[in-house]
């Protein structure tokens, strides 16, 4: 009984349950392959509990192992379109601090119009994740077609 | 030592570890695009710990943020078959209560025969999740090819 | 306060937070369709906390429900290559003990060059997971393109 009470009294943050799910805000200017994200209940079903957005990029606030997941769907796309505009590639990586820059997850669309994947990776407080979309097809902004999120799993 | 004992005595449900993994039971009648799911140890490796099935649809029993994941493979399918049939799309959404109806996750097969994705989303007690498959190709009932599940992540 | 202290003193292992993320080491000899994995901080961002590697295959150390995820990208691949070398299939399963042998997750590449999926499944201490790649195309060893992992979710 005492444990249950204590558990309820502890702030969730102290349990390390950092989590975020983001929706696409906009693409970058011409020479910037990054996707810019947004999140918050006012926008729909996106949210940030722990991590923060820094100019549309996701910044981690707690060290740990995270499950990172993403889905990106190309707008006005068919397998014909996709193959004619090949190659379109999505890469998720740590883009800052520069000393920790690395690609975590990379997928090409080939003849498809959607990519979706997930992976476990260690992230540190201050790591900023960037999602780079190369190619000439625009990503869909529909919230059920394009989204990006992280979930703290363990220290 | 005392904490470890207390932890073992607490029912898992009180920790909020609701989780379910379902296998395909059958498709709906002519005008019903929903997939009907089943779960339980007698059926193989599917299970429900917390959520319940209501006429083949998954009903949530605990408020929180959930990781929802799905894989659907089309039966007797090749990239040629897939391209020669009406676009096949899968959508996962809250279908009841009607006031909370929304599409959470949507994917098209294009020239592929399998879609797989996952996302984090807030769900509330009583939310029923439906998986709508539009198109004219039958989904595989093999348990390693088609499955649908949710995992409670945090309040 | 007492609970917070106790929580910090408890080893993570006692909370059941077993987790692993692996990178591809090599493919098997001619008649062996298995992929051989490796993990550890010295190799990059792969790691094993709880599970172990047994001759390149992942062995589970704690009973429970796990989230299993995988991404495999074929090397030097285009949709044309993929369709000419079809069928290439990836299956993740329990390969030992033999009494528990079962396919958990299966995907074909069709005209694509990457597959990615995830599922929840019960696993028991001693279960060894194998990932079988059939086909004539080589998997990429890039750590952001090919990876395999498990995450303990609940008892």
């Amino acid at each position: 009984q005492r444990f249950a009470q204590a558990q309820q009294q502890l702030p969730l943050e102290s349990l390390g349950w950092d989590v975020a799910e983001l929706q696409l805000n906009h693409t970058g200017p011409q020479q910037d392959p990054r996707l810019y994200w947004q999140g918050g209940p006012a926008l729909g079903r996106s949210f940030l509990h722990g991590p923060e957005l820094d100019k549309g990029q996701l910044r981690i606030h707690r060290d740990g192992i995270y499950m990172v997941h993403i889905q990106v769907t190309l707008a006005i796309c068919s397998s014909t379109t996709a193959s004619r505009h090949h190659p379109t590639t999505l890469a998720v990586g740590i883009c800052s601090p520069a000393s920790r820059s690395i690609s975590l997850l990379r997928l090409s669309f080939h003849q498809g119009c959607t990519i979706a994947s997930q992976r476990l990776t260690p992230l540190a407080r201050g790591d900023t994740l960037c999602t780079n979309l190369t190619g000439t097809l625009l990503p869909s902004r529909n919230t059920d077609e394009t989204f990006f999120g992280v979930q703290w799993v363990r220290p | 030592q005392r904490f470890a004992q207390a932890q073992q005595q607490l029912p898992l449900e009180s920790l909020g570890w609701d989780v379910a993994e379902l296998q395909l039971n059958h498709t709906g009648p002519q005008q019903d695009p929903r997939l009907y799911w089943q779960g339980g140890p007698a059926l193989g490796r599917s299970f429900l710990h917390g959520p319940e099935l209501d006429k083949g649809q998954l009903r949530i029993h605990r408020d929180g943020i959930y990781m929802v994941h799905i894989q659907v493979t089309l039966a007797i399918c090749s990239s040629t078959t897939a391209s020669r049939h009406h676009p096949t799309t899968l959508a996962v959404g809250i279908c009841s209560p009607a006031s909370r109806s929304i599409s959470l996750l949507r994917l098209s097969f294009h020239q592929g025969c399998t879609i797989a994705s996952q996302r984090l989303t807030p769900l509330a007690r009583g939310d029923t999740l439906c998986t709508n498959l539009t198109g004219t190709l039958l989904p595989s009932r093999n348990t390693d090819e088609t499955f649908f599940g949710v995992q409670w992540v945090r309040p | 306060q007492r609970f917070a202290q106790a929580q910090q003193q408890l080893p993570l292992e006692s909370l059941g937070w077993d987790v692993a993320e692996l990178q591809l080491n090599h493919t098997g000899p001619q008649q062996d369709p298995r992929l051989y994995w490796q993990g550890g901080p010295a190799l990059g961002r792969s790691f094993l906390h709880g599970p172990e590697l047994d001759k390149g295959q992942l062995r589970i150390h704690r009973d429970g429900i796990y989230m299993v995820h995988i991404q495999v990208t074929l090397a030097i691949c285009s949709s044309t290559t993929a369709s000419r070398h079809h069928p290439t299939t990836l299956a993740v399963g329990i390969c030992s003990p033999a009494s528990r042998s079962i396919s958990l997750l299966r995907l074909s590449f069709h005209q694509g060059c990457t597959i990615a999926s995830q599922r929840l499944t019960p696993l028991a201490r001693g279960d060894t997971l194998c990932t079988n790649l059939t086909g004539t195309l080589l998997p990429s060893r890039n750590t952001d393109e090919t990876f395999f992992g498990v995450q303990w979710v609940r008892p």
Partner: antibody, heavy 119, light 111 residues
Framework: EVQMVQSGAEVKKPGASVKVSCKAS????????IHWVRQAPGQGLEWMGD????????SYNQKFRDRVTMTRDTSTSTVYMELSSLRSEDTAVYYC????????????WGQGTLVTVSS | DIVMTQSPDSLAVSLGERATINCRAS??????????MHWYQQKPGQPPKLLIY???NLESGVPDRFSGSGSGTDFTLTISSLQAEDVAVYYC?????????FGGGTKVEIK
Amino acid sequence: EVQMVQSGAEVKKPGASVKVSCKASGYTFTTYNIHWVRQAPGQGLEWMGDIYPGTGDASYNQKFRDRVTMTRDTSTSTVYMELSSLRSEDTAVYYCATFSRFDGWFAYWGQGTLVTVSS
Amino acid sequence: DIVMTQSPDSLAVSLGERATINCRASRSVSTSGYSYMHWYQQKPGQPPKLLIYLADNLESGVPDRFSGSGSGTDFTLTISSLQAEDVAVYYCQHSRELPYTFGGGTKVEIK
């Protein structure tokens, strides 16, 4: 209500071609593949091929591959089956058919078109 | 091509009695959790009518005296209590792969 209405009976000479039409109504024409099945007098059923009206992409039974062409006109929701180099054994009732939800079995059939090949 | 063999070629059954028609495929038509076998009824001068799909699913509007069973290569259509309006030729068809093929048909008559 789904309906498939076929063109009328035809009499053709050996070596000629015949083009049978099938007009679909009661559903979204571009959604469902339309199949052609033939039945010689007093004989069984034989699948000839199908067409996906969304793109016009067709698949044919190898037996007829060199002689059959399936096309569609989305503006009139009509599909056509043309069989060339006719011979007497092509005398049959030709049916168009489609399905109700998933492809592979045929819930809706046209009334049939009798094609007689005779010199 | 998968060859479908129906038996018997013809069958005479008394009204109210059970009629059983068999269909054997030259190789398995079961995969992905389904058996891709379907049954049709055809009366003279009419197109075939779908009775059973995927081995054991009754098509909407079809009387429940019709049932299907089987898996792999061997399948059965059963009419539990034959009625006068059931006099017809019955065909099996597979859709496991292209080309789809039909059985040769079984003629059901009243004894």
